[in-house]
Interface confidence: medium
């Protein structure tokens, strides 16, 4: 079989968007299935038509409506004949047009002055492809062969700069890129004291413009009033936007203030935020522990705990905790230091401790106190001691 | 004169298996590619695929893939449509089309210039 | 799976212009073709590659194609023009067929 692509040289050069018809002709086979390759692979397309001219002689048609720099490459034809395959010799496609940008300017960000550089690169075909640059609507110098590097000494406000690429086809104008100045970062916001405890807390805030550069550190400043003496202060790199105040003094007015820095320099301090440490729990166990048993039931009593530190702050309720072998437990809050305990299973042993609360927590449990099931009365000892 | 004939209408219950053909006179068969169209009742048409001038290559529509079959038969020039299980929904007229014709140039091919005059298949329990 | 889109229905007075469109994201690169049904008839192709006319076919047929949409033109339009008319293309990557959905054309 004889193939040959009709009506196209080695290489065709065709314009952008225009139609491209390939023929390929093939003689001396009566029924062949003709297959279009390009750059190797087999073209899926159900354009491909058949056209006989005589009996052992058809055409194949590929047609491309539109052609695109994708399209260009290498084409030929192919039938399989007795098993094998036969090619015709291939066809070069070029498709030209106006420039296109591997390369456009891209947005930046610079410090006021500071020297930055911009580039720019297209292709063809058709080679050369020159580029001129325009700052704003104002050209900048001439044109200077693909790729392109605008060197800007520096600029004082935003600034738009764009390049064009021109070849014998036309030209083509890149994306507008905008150079913004950089600044100092906005003052942060939404400062919010969380998970407080008596020697620590943790703080959240969200943060301000960042200028257009990257926010590199926070600043945490702790006084212990607004305008007093600063107590700590904690740089912090970011993101995240938190930071854990260590070694607190319990029961205690602080304020603290934020601000965060990007290359430039710090933001203003945030509005100060005031907050107070937790004071202490109870640092000691109510003593003397002891019961009195009579007709209706049982009394317990024990004597009053004095504060040891005023960060323990005032003392409040107790706590009485009891709990029965069978499995019977309670807890009950008495504002004195005498309690009467109802609902308790006399004929079982009782083991009973109390401690002393505040605003914090309770204090240490008390030594416990064993009331036995055969004792009129119980005293303070270890578990399952007996009293008389 | 070009010519398609198409087997005649059918009616058949869902599950069962069907074959409609469409035999080519006026020109040689292995010149050209046969492509079926779907018409519902009411409905636009629906490429559902295309066979090759000597049955080596089929190209199926993403709706018709792996549910209908297209074949040919180079010796009694008759292109086929084939059901192995019908649907209800496969109720439609179905055309046989002539993929690819000449002008009086002879060199510029057109699309689908021949029709059959469709074979109606109706699938009803 | 690939979509051409045609409205519904156009209507015109005779004599007026009829214009029905095809739009699809392929249509820059493949080629539109037009068929003509009218009822209880098999369709007839009217146009070929986007605005070639097909033999025996009225002058007052026309085709056009720019980027995504293809349009057919029926320039002067007669009471016989009345059907519906699909439009044709293939997908993307060249492997399937689509019809659009068809525009019913009355021409009062």
């Known amino acids: 079989a004889g193939l040959k692509l009709m009506g196209a040289p080695v290489k065709l050069t065709v314009s952008q968007g225009q139609p491209v018809k390939l023929n390929c002709s093939v003689e001396g086979m009566e029924e062949p299935d003709i297959q279009w390759v390009k750059d190797g692979a087999v073209v899926q397309n159900l354009d491909q038509l058949y056209i006989p001219v005589s009996e052992q002689h058809w055409i194949g048609f590929l047609s491309l409506k539109s052609v695109e720099r994708s399209d260009a490459g290498r084409y030929w034809c192919q039938v399989e004949d007795g098993g094998e395959t036969e090619i015709s010799q291939p066809v070069w496609l070029t498709v030209e047009g106006v420039p296109f940008f591997t390369v456009e300017p891209k947005d930046l960000a610079v410090p006021p002055n500071a020297p930055f550089q911009l580039s720019c690169e297209a292709v063809g075909p058709p080679e050369p492809v020159t580029i001129v640059w325009w700052r704003g609507t104002t050209k900048i110098g001439g044109p200077a062969p693909s790729p392109s590097v605008l060197n800007v000494t520096g600029v004082t406000q935003s600034t738009m700069f764009s390049c064009e690429a021109h070849n014998l086809k036309g030209l083509a104008s890149s994306r507008t890129a905008t150079v913004h100045l950089q600044a100092l970062p906005a003052a942060p916001f939404n400062i919010t004291v969380t998970k407080l405890s008596s020697s620590n807390a943790s703080v959240a805030w969200m943060p301000g413009a960042d200028g257009r550069a990257l926010l590199q550190s926070c600043t945490v400043q702790v006084t212990q009033a607004p305008g007093g003496w600063e107590v700590l202060a904690v740089v912090v790199p970011v993101p995240p936007f938190t930071c854990l105040l260590r070694d607190l003094v319990p029961a205690t007015n602080y304020s603290l203030r934020v601000r965060c820095a990007n290359a430039l320099g710090p933001s203003p301090y945030a509005d100060w935020v005031p907050f107070q440490t937790k004071g202490l729990a109870p640092a000691s166990a109510p003593q003397n522990l002891h019961a009195i048993r009579t007709d209706s039931g049982l009394i317990l009593e024990w004597e009053e705990v004095i504060p040891e530190a005023p960060l323990e702050g005032p003392l409040g309720p107790y706590k009485l905790s009891w709990v029965q072998d069978n499995g019977t437990q309670d807890e009950l809050t008495v504002e004195g230091t005498r309690a009467n305990l109802t609902g308790w299973d006399p004929q079982k042993d009782l083991i009973v401790r109390v401690c002393v609360s505040n605003a914090v927590g309770c204090g240490p449990w008390s030594q416990p106190l064993v009331v036995s099931s055969h004792d009129r009365a119980g005293q303070q000892g270890p578990p399952h001691s007996r009293t008389s | 004169e070009v010519q398609l004939v198409q087997s005649g209408a059918d009616v058949k219950k869902p599950g069962a298996s069907l074959t409609i053909s469409c035999q080519a006179s006026g020109y040689t068969f292995t010149d050209y590619w046969i492509s079926w169209v779907r018409q519902k009742p009411g409905k636009g048409l629906e490429w559902m695929g295309r066979i090759s001038r000597h049955g080596s290559q089929t190209y199926y529509g993403p709706s018709f893939q792996g549910h209908v079959t297209i074949s040919a038969d180079r010796s009694t020039a008759t292109a086929y449509l084939q059901w192995r299980s019908l649907e209800a929904s496969d109720t439609a007229m179905y055309y046989c089309v002539r993929a690819g014709g000449q002008t009086s140039g002879g060199t510029i091919p057109e699309y689908y210039q021949h029709w059959g005059p469709g074979t109606l298949v109706t699938v009803s329990s | 799976s690939y979509e051409l889109t045609q409205p519904p229905s156009v209507s015109v007075s005779p004599g007026q212009t009829a214009r029905i469109t095809c739009s699809g994201d392929a249509l820059p690169k493949k080629y539109a073709y037009w068929y003509q049904q009218k009822s209880g008839q098999a369709p007839v192709l009217v146009i070929y590659?986007?605005?070639k006319r097909a033999s025996g076919i009225p002058e007052r047929f026309s085709g056009s194609s720019s980027g995504t949409m293809a349009t057919l033109t029926i320039s002067g339009a007669q009471v016989e023009d009345e059907a519906d008319y699909y439009c044709?293309?293939?997908?993307?990557?060249?492997?399937?067929?689509?019809f659009g959905g068809g525009t019913k054309l009355t021409v009062l």
């Open positions: 590659e986007d605005h």
């Open positions: 044709y293309s293939i997908s993307p990557a060249g492997n399937y067929g689509v």
